[in-house]
């Protein structure tokens, strides 16, 4: 669809005569008839296949034609067509004299014709005017013409229909060749696809309008590029949705089990060295002079009973001092000035002369010790508690306070690592020499059977439209990651039908 436009510019008829040579009375009141038809090698009379148009009287004898409407007519003259422009044409322009006001062909005498021109040729669609001038013996006509496409038609022969739009079906204007030119923010063959917020993740985000970003389930953040971890994940992160990858020092399904008690709680006091020994379990290695599970107790140097022969020990800032009983001397009261004649053996001990009576030795009854049998036996001296247990004197007996993981009178028994039921989800525990091992029931795995591998909710292919399926391990349900253009829990809705999301 297009328009052949003819712009009449000037008509010269100096003598004011008709084609017959007869003069017009009082002058030639001139109007034009135009016939546009298909290409003919020799332009002949016959139907104006492409259309006709007539003008009102435009002037008398010689005159210029204005560019706008003149006396109700239009200039340029419009010859619309509703077909593909063939690129060739024939054009007949007749100048007529109008004696009266009736310009219909049947109302005019046949000799009212002033002049007739006929041209034919090729003409491409375009904005540029072709200027032409036709001269006869008595008249001259200057005119220009062109073919342009109607609104919404484009291309070399006005055959491409393109109507600009900005609605659900497209967002574009038309280029001169009829191709679509998307409005800013839109893309795709028909410019129906919005260009999302810059950086919005290609798979995890989508949009319904330019510069928007909507997140698919399991993703968050301004650009939908940050996964949502497992609900309840305490000390962990994710790289895909609903994961809980534990930070260093944490374990368990929700990363809430402390595997680094030493770092997180610093339980050892007085500069002791802390060693992790399992979940919420640790061992403190005390510096000299300290004792206790957390090395919280200060040791007295007199606790080791360094004074012999009944000497009494006094703690001092820089060590200790022995106060010796009569007859003894030395740093630890280890030297004697007595002999068996002085009855030096206490608690029923028997005296034996040594070195020709220069000194002596006491043989002590059970439960007593010391060079003079002056001390009750300290049941802890022999360090009877195994595996780092702490020995405590309790009257006539003794007892061992065991470190975590040990039991028995002398802390000689290793507590079963399995006693704490460390295997989750009904796993079977096996004690090993240096730890334990869990045998997991079907559907679970991991060191402690803490990883659920049972039901693959994605096995039934619940996601539509080529969506990616993820299994949410906490609930044995699935999450569908929809491709562009689809939403819904199973990606079953095209974007045009907005679902309601739970957030």
């Amino acid at each position: 669809s297009g328009v052949f436009q003819l712009q009449l510019q000037e008509f010269i008829n100096e003598r004011g005569v008709l084609a017959s040579g007869r003069p017009c009375e009082p002058g030639c009141r001139t109007f034009f008839r135009v016939c546009l038809k298909h290409f003919q090698a020799v332009v002949s009379p016959g139907p104006c296949t492409f259309g006709t148009v007539s003008t009102p009287v435009l002037g008398t004898n010689s005159f210029a034609v204005r560019d706008d409407s003149s006396g109700g007519g239009r200039n340029p003259l419009q010859l619309p067509f509703n077909f593909t422009w063939p690129g060739t044409f024939s054009l007949i322009i007749e100048a007529w004299h109008a004696p009266g006001d009736d310009l219909r062909p049947e109302a005019l005498p046949p000799d009212a014709l002033i002049s007739k021109i006929a041209i034919q040729g090729s003409l491409a669609v375009g904005q540029n005017w072709l200027l032409d001038e036709q001269t006869s013996t008595l008249t001259r006509l200057r005119y220009s013409y062109r073919v342009i496409c109607s609104d919404n038609y484009y291309g070399d022969n006005c055959s491409r229909l393109c109507k600009k739009r900005n609605d659900h079906f497209g967002h574009y204007v038309c280029q001169p060749d009829g191709n679509l030119s998307c409005l800013p923010g839109w893309t795709g063959e028909y410019c129906q696809q919005p260009i999302c917020l810059s950086g919005c993740h290609e798979q995890n985000g989508y949009c319904s309008k330019p510069a928007e970003c909507l997140c698919r389930p399991g993703w968050q953040g301004r650009l939908c590029n940050e996964c949502i971890p497992h609900n309840g994940c305490r000390h962990g992160t994710c790289s895909t949705p609903w994961q809980c990858t534990c930070d260093e020092g944490w374990g368990g399904l929700f990363c809430d089990q402390d595997l680094n008690y030493c770092t997180h709680h610093s339980p050892c006091k007085n500069g002791a060295t802390c060693s992790n020994s399992g979940q919420r379990s640790y061992t403190c290695t005390c510096r000299p002079g300290y004792t206790g599970v957390d090395c919280e107790l200060e040791l007295s140097e007199c606790d080791s009973n360094p004074c012999r022969n009944g000497g009494s020990c006094k703690d001092q800032e820089d060590g200790y001092h022995c106060l010796c009983p009569p007859g003894y001397y030395g740093l630890h009261c280890e030297h004697s000035t007595l002999s068996c004649a002085d009855s030096p053996c206490f608690n029923g001990g028997s005296c034996r002369e040594r070195n020709q009576g220069a000194n002596y030795a006491c043989e002590c009854p059970p439960n007593f010790t010391g060079s003079n049998c002056e001390k009750k036996v300290d049941r802890c001296t022999s360090n009877p508690c195994a595996n780092g247990g702490q020995c405590l004197n309790r009257g006539p007996s003794r007892m061992c306070r065991c470190r975590p993981g040990f039991t028995g009178t002398y802390c000689e028994l290793h507590v079963s690592d399995c006693a704490r039921n460390p295997c989750a989800h009904g796993g079977t525990c096996h004690d090993l020499e240096n730890g334990l091992m869990c045998t997991c029931p079907a559907g679970f795995s991991g060191r402690r059977c803490e990883v659920r591998t049972s039901i693959d909710a994605c096995a039934s292919s619940p996601c539509f439209n080529r969506a990616t399926c993820y299994t949410d391990l906490s609930t044995d349900t699935f999450v569908c990651n929809c491709p562009y253009g689809f939403v819904g829990s199973r990606c079953e809705f095209p974007v045009g039908l907005p679902p309601s999301f739970p957030w």
Epitope: K209, A211, L214, Q220, C224, E226, P229, G496
Partner: antibody, heavy 121, light 110 residues
Framework: EVQLQQSGPELAKPGSSVKISCKAS????????ISWIKQTTGQGLEYIGY????????DYNEKFKDKATLTVDKSSRTVFMQLSSLTPGDSAVYYC??????????????WGQGVMVTVSS | DTVLTQSPALAVSLGQRVTISCKAS??????????IYWYQQKLGQQPRLLIY???TLASGVPARFSGSGSGTDFTLNIDPVEADDIATYFC?????????FGSGTKLEIK
């Protein structure tokens, strides 16, 4: 029950810095965002920035880029905001708020009680 | 920055319906959602979320609150108004960076 407990009021001198805190409880801390909002009588409510409490990633309003620094301590479930080079114009109530951020959707579903910061010589 | 314009104050009778408006300097809507949110702040307290994405009621908010609108014009409706609703109401947008708030509308009793 979601709760955000903010630290106490601050009185600071021009040119100095303050660090205010926001301790979260009652929800999965590492899967959310904490935003900070400034409220003054003249300017109303202004968005300062947010932090992803799981990854530590941050986003700032251009206006506050050189003023505020957001950090997180996951072990104590606490988010901090340091305000530097203080001027009297920084005197305001500062709120922390748990935030929902799903692409173009962003809103503040739980708010702390606010911290009054006064800058005066 | 996207500017959100609210009228400073509104006087209302208890039991009546009230409409609080928020006008944006640009469209805040897409075919899916409108990116506007409403908060209530009582004197001396922190703000509280009422409505998200223009019309969805936040958890624990009474049904007498509702939100509507699209493009650049949005409203928060309270019907009927109760004495407990006396507060300042703020709108907020998330369509463009930076996120911005309206200046607030103070609801007063006639």
């Amino acid at each position: 029950e979601v709760q955000l407990q903010q630290s106490g009021p601050e009185l600071a001198k021009p040119g100095s810095s303050v660090k205010i805190s926001c301790k979260a409880s009652g929800y999965t801390f590492t899967s959310s965002y904490i935003s900070w909002i400034k409220q003054t009588t003249g300017q109303g409510l202004e968005y300062i920035g947010y932090i992803n409490t799981g990854s530590g990633g941050t986003d700032y309003n251009e206006k506050f880029k050189d003023k505020a620094t957001l950090t997180v301590d996951k072990s104590s479930r606490t988010v901090f905001m340091q305000l530097s080079s203080l001027t009297p114009g920084d005197s305001a109530v500062y709120y922390c708020a748990k935030s929902i951020l799903l692409g173009s959707t962003y809103y503040l579903d739980y708010w702390g009680q606010g911290v009054m910061v006064t800058v005066s010589s | 920055d996207t500017v959100l314009t609210q009228s400073p104050a509104l006087a209302v009778s208890l039991g009546q319906r009230v409409t609080i408006s928020c006008k944006a300097s640009r469209s805040l809507s897409s075919p899916m959602y409108s990116y506007i949110y409403w908060y209530q702040q009582k004197l001396g307290q922190q703000p509280r979320l009422l409505i998200y994405r223009a019309s969805t009621l936040a958890s624990g908010v009474p049904a007498r609150f509702s939100g509507s609108g699209s493009g650049t014009d949005f409203t928060l409706n309270i019907d009927p108004v109760e004495a407990d609703d006396i507060a300042t109401y703020f709108c907020q947008q998330s369509w463009s960076d930076p996120f911005t708030f309206g200046s607030g509308t103070k609801l007063e009793i006639k």
